[in-house]
Interface confidence: medium
């Protein structure tokens, strides 16, 4: 029943070209190259992709042709290493080209940059975009793939093909509409927001595999799939987990052709076997391939089977617990996780993994004790505080969110996190805290039974953003500790951090708090980011400032911006009133 056992192919590149078709092949090679060489111009990448495609066609015609037997890593790596400006543009990444496979590919992977120094994507006028779309649809869509892939080097490639399909559909429909902007802009906003979320979710999967290993990813997958498919047998869930792990390992490793091919096979298998997996798959399985795979990945949890008995019989009360555990530890723990998760769609995946870890630790200790049964008899009692901690945290934060609204809730988190880890760069603190704050609008509207899986699993994704950004330029031992010690305890670790008493406040710099008339033309979101940047800087200057002090300064700041944006001579207003504001703020905070 292994989906991915294939006959050996004389030419791997020909095999993937035939499986995927020319259009998907070219798109995936472009994504792969853009994710590796993030600074290269679009035209250079298109040229490389065309060369690879022509070569693949010669191999399809004759699999025995010269070089057709080479691995994809060898073919693609050789092609990337032909880039003339590699040393000037990428510095030490050029050293990768002196290595042999598989070390060369590992080297390229290590140089992927989660925060590349690229200009922000500015959206042109709708008419300009529609003209470009009509003039050359193929180039327009390739440019989309290229720009997203280079900014998100771990974006899930087969899913990016799905986004591109929706992007094309939006332009096809809206460029013919009477009011192009009204039709197109909301669709592009939705794609942008969904794309950022998709990128962040995939980044966590890759971090899980790369930093914590396959076992950690498989545990996550067992828990999530058991929640989603509670009627499926353990053997079925195990099979899906094995196949899903292969797909994500490939994509995270840059093997995008194999990944897309195997993801399609997995979707096919799931749809052919939906009777033994889930009753919720019917609609997904009627869709075309890209939509089908996306739909399956997002499908709602199936109903739990009726009358599932207590878990205690097999995992606590049985006298054979230690015998069964010793026989096959990971299988036994996998079964525990499966049985617990299918009964608890109301728990976050990370909580389920904490419970499984606690259970494992207890068995390791108790199965070596004089009376194992007596020792592990109360293991389920140890779960209670682990369950209550996220429940209480979510309750408190949702109350705060409902009281403050999203923007002020984000500000509360900005202050909280800046005090915990003030060494982290201001843009990272702003970005992460803004995203943490979005948990309110995303999850607090849900009923109790859906709040925890929504909130805590979303927070895991956001905190992973902090971890990968911090890893690039580490500045805080506390962040490093929370990020590296335990994947499932990252959120509790950050929650438990108090104010960093060792931090030496930043020197006051008036320039940081100098604003100009350009703030008036910014969108509401950009204006919020400016104010939140100032708030982080304030806390870095005065970490012991009270909420009341900070609120007073921020209220003054909002009033100052509003006043000067209404003034006839805005720039003069910002210069003169700005000085007064800085002086008043310094006095208020005792700087």
């Amino acid at each position: 029943r292994g989906v991915f056992r294939r006959d050996a192919h004389k030419s791997e590149v020909a095999h993937r070209f035939k499986d995927l078709g020319e259009e998907n092949f070219k798109a995936l090679v472009l994504i792969a190259f853009a994710q590796y060489l993030q600074q290269c111009p679009f035209e250079d990448h298109v040229k490389l992709v065309n060369e690879v495609t022509e070569f693949a066609k010669t191999c399809v015609a004759d699999e025995s042709a010269e070089n057709c037997d080479k691995s994809l890593h060898t073919l693609f790596g050789d092609k990337l290493c032909t880039v003339a400006t590699l040393r000037e543009t990428y510095g030490e990444m050029a050293d990768c080209c002196a290595k042999q496979e598989p070390e060369r590919n590992e080297c390229f992977l290590q140089h992927k940059d989660d925060n590349p120094n690229l200009p922000r994507l500015v959206r042109p006028e709708v008419d300009v975009m529609c003209t470009a779309f009509h003039d050359n649809e193929e180039t327009f869509l390739k440019k989309y793939l290229y720009e997203i892939a280079r900014r998100h080097p771990y974006f899930y490639a087969p899913e990016l093909l799905f986004f591109a399909k929706r992007y094309k559909a939006a332009f096809t429909e809206c460029c013919q509409a009477a009011d192009k902007a009204a039709c197109l802009l909301p669709k592009l906003d939705e794609l942008r927001d969904e794309g950022k979320a998709s990128s962040a979710k995939q980044r966590l999967k890759c971090a899980s595999l790369q930093k914590f290993g396959e076992r950690a990813f498989k545990a996550w997958a067992v828990a999530r799939l058991s929640q989603r498919f509670p009627k499926a047998e353990f053997a079925e869930v195990s099979k899906l987990v094995t196949d899903l792990t292969k797909v994500h390992t490939e994509c995270c490793h840059g093997d995008l052709l194999e990944c897309a091919d195997d993801r399609a096979d997995l979707a096919k298998y799931i749809c052919e076997n939906q009777d033994s997996i889930s009753s919720k798959l019917k609609e997904c399985c009627e869709k075309p391939l890209l939509e089908k795979s996306h739909c399956i990945a997002e499908v709602e949890n199936d109903e739990m089977p009726a009358d599932l008995p207590s878990l205690a019989a097999d995992f606590v009360e049985s006298k054979d617990v230690c015998k069964n555990y010793a026989e096959a530890k990971d299988v036994f723990l996998g079964m525990f996780l499966y049985e617990y998760a299918r009964r608890h769609p109301d728990y976050s995946v990370v909580l389920l993994l904490r419970l499984a870890k606690t259970y494992e630790t207890t068995l390791e200790k108790c199965c070596a004790a004089a009376d194992p049964h007596e020792c592990y008899a109360k293991v389920f009692d140890e779960f209670k505080p682990l369950v209550e901690e996220p429940q209480n945290l979510i309750k408190q934060n949702c109350e705060l969110f409902e009281q403050l609204g999203e923007y002020k809730f984000q500000n509360a988190l900005l202050v909280r996190y800046t005090k915990k880890v003030p060494q982290v760069s201001t843009p990272t603190l702003v970005e992460v805290s803004r995203n943490l704050g979005k948990v309110g609008s995303k999850c607090c509207k849900h009923p109790e039974a859906k709040r925890m899986p929504c909130a805590e699993d979303y927070l895991s994704v956001v905190l992973n953003q902090l971890c990968v950004l911090h890893e690039k330029t580490p500045v805080s031992d506390r962040v490093t500790k929370c990020c590296t010690e335990s994947l499932v305890n990252r959120r509790p670790c950050f929650s438990a951090l108090e104010v960093d008493e060792t931090y030496v406040p930043k020197e006051f710099n008036a320039e940081t708090f100098t604003f100009h008339a350009d703030i008036c033309t910014l969108s509401e979101k950009e204006r919020q980011i400016k104010k939140q940047t100032a708030l982080v800087e304030l806390v870095k200057h005065k970490p012991k400032a009270t909420k009341e002090q900070l609120k007073a300064v921020m209220d003054d700041f909002a009033a100052f911006v509003e006043k000067c944006c209404k003034a006839d001579d805005k720039e003069t207003c910002f210069a003169e009133e700005g000085k007064k504001l800085v002086a008043a703020s310094q006095a208020a905070l005792g700087l």
């Epitope: 353990f234 053997a235 195990s238 009358d307 019989a313 097999d314 299988v331 036994f332």
Partner: nanobody
Framework: EVQLVESGGGLVHAGGSLRLSCAAS????????MGWFRQAPGKEREFVAA????????YYSDSVKGQFTISRDNAKNTVYLQMNSLKPEDTAVYYC?????????????????????WGQGTQVTVSS
């Protein structure tokens, strides 16, 4: 060592019912998951149904789902297979089997290799 003895087979008309029993000797019956397999003349042995220790968790082959019911009585060391709406294609020798390896129950409950002990079998013949 567990010994298994099947009973309840026989000749029945299409549409009729039979209840097979499998009596197990030995004090550790409740440690085993139990299965029924069948083998028609000239065909390979095929999985029919299985039940876990406690009796709540069951597996069925697609061909008998909704038609056969497996159950067990740990007090009597017996497992049952209630067969309704029998068809001529249900004609076979029915074997009872016991498996003791916990992980096999979860990972390969339909595989004969997961079962350590087997009965001699009981013949079921369904006439049209």
């Amino acid at each position: 060592e567990v010994q298994l003895v099947e009973s309840g087979g026989g000749l029945v008309h299409a549409g009729g019912s039979l209840r097979l029993s499998c009596a197990a000797s030995g004090p550790t019956f409740s440690n085993y998951f139990m299965g029924w397999f069948r083998q028609a003349p000239g065909k390979e042995r095929e999985f029919v149904a299985a039940v876990k220790w406690s009796g709540y968790h069951t597996y069925y082959s697609d061909s008998v789902k909704g038609q056969f019911t497996i159950s067990r009585d740990n007090a009597k060391n017996t497992v049952y297979l209630q067969m309704n709406s029998l068809k001529p294609e249900d004609t076979a020798v029915y074997y009872c089997a016991a498996g003791g390896t916990f992980s096999n129950w979860y990972t390969r409950p339909r595989s004969g290799d997961s079962y350590d002990h087997w009965g001699q079998g009981t013949q079921v013949t369904v006439s049209s």
